[in-house]
């Protein structure tokens, strides 16, 4: 039986939240999990290791608060459930070119039909290179 | 059958790129994977979770751009393939003692004979303590 | 047979080291592993992926050195073994509100009765939201 696994990479035509992902070209993996409108859709209940990295950068630092969230949505809960989150404030010297990453990864018990997404606070500050910004999971 | 797994730790006599790793002493693991001259060599095609952490520090901050890459080399591609990368710019206050880590981890489909390496931009700024700087993988 | 897995989240009534964790409510997982006085207790020898994230923040930056350690204690060693560690120095602009995360994750060969803990240098600077600060592992 095929391993349930996904590794999606940054897609620069993301225009709004949640982030959209490259699911076809490059170092992408998608097996036994569905990708739909920015989300990974679980089709088998179980334990999953879920991870994401986002690469933020800018030409001139103004220390806008940055956040990076992996959240879950399903029909049983009226609200999104934030599974993992990273926040950064006061992280660079005003006016300078800057760059910083946020990495998240943990184990969760996911249910068939759960949808997982990634959110960031400042879309314009995200660099979408495939090696720098990604989102993935695998079933234990 | 033995699990294919590796956890290598920092080796302070690294003098050039890619980084060299401790493969024998301390909290090192190496099973079903070969370590050869800085690289982890895959001997069974499949899905692997690959990770690395690098600890950068310095006595007096000058905000040199830092990069940390996990890359792959094999006979199918003429060029190295950067699998994961972290970059930092404008991350400390000029003149101060500073310290910062970069963590990378994700799932990849690797092929027998692929070799994986870690590169950093500023070797002199890396601290090689076994708990701080490491490189590993395991087959799912 | 049940998968050996744990995902514990931040507990704001931690008053001393090692950190204490929420092991009952929210997005917590605990199966085939025991939680005891801040520690995860291994009950089956084998390979484990161990991870932790800590979210540090403060109202007014004074660049106190921050450290985040995952360490192991057992009856065979007189001293704690630091498995993974992250350190930060000179990471924010003096006087400003700031926030930063540290993430650690790697594979270790653990033995039945090993106790795993998380330590931080500045307890008062840790935010214990369940999505921000956590500690987990799973048996490969």
């Amino acid at each position: 039986e095929l391993r349930k696994v996904a590794h999606l990479t940054g897609k620069s035509n993301s225009r709004s939240m949640p982030l959209e992902w490259e699911d076809t070209y490059g170092i992408v993996l998608l097996s036994g999990v569905k990708y739909k409108k920015g989300g990974l859709v679980i089709n088998e209940t179980g334990l999953y290791f879920v991870y994401s990295k986002v690469y933020f950068r800018g030409q001139s630092c103004n220390n806008l608060p940055l956040s990076h969230k992996v959240y879950m949505r399903n029909s049983k809960y009226p609200q999104d459930l934030v599974m993992m989150e990273g926040k950064m404030m006061s992280y660079c010297t005003t006016g300078q070119m800057w760059a910083r990453s946020s990495y998240l990864g943990a184990v969760f018990n996911l249910t068939s039909a759960d949808h997982l997404y990634v959110n960031v606070s400042e879309l314009s500050l995200v660099n979408f290179e495939e090696s720098q910004t990604f989102f993935g999971l695998y079933k234990l | 059958e033995l699990r294919k797994v590796a956890h290598l730790t920092g080796k302070s006599n690294s003098r050039s790129m890619p980084l060299e790793w401790e493969d024998t002493y301390g909290i090192v693991l190496l099973s079903g994977v070969k370590y050869k001259k800085g690289g982890l060599v895959i001997n069974e095609t499949g899905l692997y979770f690959v990770y690395s952490k690098v600890y950068f520090r310095g006595q007096s901050c000058n905000n040199l751009p830092l990069s940390h890459k996990v890359y792959m080399r094999n006979s199918k591609y003429p060029q190295d393939l950067v699998m994961m990368e972290g970059k930092m710019m404008s991350y400390c206050t000029t003149g101060q003692m500073w310290a910062r880590s970069s963590y990378l981890g994700a799932v990849f489909n690797l092929t027998s004979a692929d070799h994986l390496y870690v590169n950093v931009s500023e070797l002199s700024l890396v601290n090689f303590e076994e708990s701080q700087t490491f490189f590993g993988l395991y087959k799912l | 047979e049940l998968r050996k897995v744990a995902h514990l989240t931040g507990k704001s009534n931690s008053r001393s080291m090692p950190l204490e964790w929420e092991d009952t409510y929210g997005i917590v997982l605990l199966s085939g592993v025991k939680y005891k006085k801040g520690g995860l207790v291994i009950n089956e020898t084998g390979l484990y992926f161990v991870y932790s994230k800590v979210y540090f923040r403060g109202q007014s930056c004074n660049n106190l050195p921050l450290s985040h350690k995952v360490y192991m204690r057992n009856s065979k060693y007189p001293q704690d073994l630091v498995m993974m560690e992250g350190k930060m120095m000179s990471y924010c602009t003096t006087g400003q509100m700031w926030a930063r995360s540290s993430y650690l994750g790697a594979v270790f060969n653990l033995t039945s009765a090993d106790h795993l803990y998380v330590n931080v240098s500045e307890l008062s600077l840790v935010n214990f939201e369940e999505s921000q600060t956590f500690f987990g592992l799973y048996k490969l």
């Epitope: - | 006599n13 003098r15 050039s16 001259k37 | -």
Partner: antibody, heavy 118, light 109 residues
């Protein structure tokens, strides 16, 4: 124990060629790499590529990537395929064994001459 | 990775000593992954020294290797006529990359 190269020839520019290295009296052992080194007439030695006999991982000189392909079809044979040959590839091609953990080209073949000329 | 043998040719009398230098553009693997070879016309090279200073089997102790990191030396003492040949250094680097020096001809007078 010996190595012997074969397949050297006089070929025209743009042609392709496959060189063979055959081990006699032993088979490639664990922990060793099989390599190809060349030497242009009156010039020095130039490393081309190696193959790890444990897992067939291949290692190339940066200039050799793309046009040269090393492979191991059996436990006693290593091949070197060369494409788009030019006059600059004219050389004696040696195969040699080295320890995988350090450079020590212990056993060498006598070499095979490749001449590229129109 | 570039290995430079500064002298293309050196000469000495029978019974004398010659020193050949080899400089690497970057540190070799483990600071000692360097070997030395002797090559005579129309013959393949012969291994003399590996891991900077270890003598290959069957090689006389008149051949001595030293050095670490980026600077290495081959010293041949008690020169014999038969030592007339070209000598090459070879370095091993991380990522299993190898390089040869340009060679130094030893002329025994």
């Amino acid at each position: 124990q010996s190595l012997e190269e074969s397949g050297g020839d006089l070929v025209k520019p743009g042609a392709s060629l496959t060189l063979t290295c055959t081990a006699s009296g032993f088979s490639f052992s664990s922990g060793y790499d099989m390599c190809w080194v060349r030497q242009a007439p009156g010039k020095g030695l130039e490393w081309i590529a190696c193959i790890d006999t444990d897992n067939d991982a291949t290692y190339y000189a940066s200039w050799a990537k793309g046009r040269f392909t090393i492979s191991k079809p059996s436990s006693t044979t290593v091949l070197l395929q060369i494409t788009s040959l030019t006059a600059a590839d004219t050389a004696t091609y040696f195969c040699a064994t080295t320890h995988g953990d350090y450079v020590a080209f212990k056993l060498w073949g006598p070499g095979t001459l490749v001449t590229v000329s129109s | 990775q570039v290995l430079t043998q500064t002298a293309s040719s050196v000469s000495a009398a029978v019974g004398g000593t010659v020193t050949i230098n080899c400089q690497s553009s970057q540190s070799v693997y483990k600071n000692n992954d360097l070997s030395w070879y002797q090559q005579k016309p129309r013959q393949p090279p012969k291994l003399l020294i590996y891991q900077a200073s270890k003598l290959a089997s069957g090689v006389p102790s008149r051949f001595k290797g030293s050095g670490s990191g980026t600077q290495f030396t081959l010293t041949i003492g008690d020169l014999e006529c038969d030592d007339g040949a070209t000598y090459y250094c070879a370095g091993g680097y991380t990522a299993s990359i190898y390089a040869f020096g340009g060679g130094t001809e030893v002329v025994v007078k």
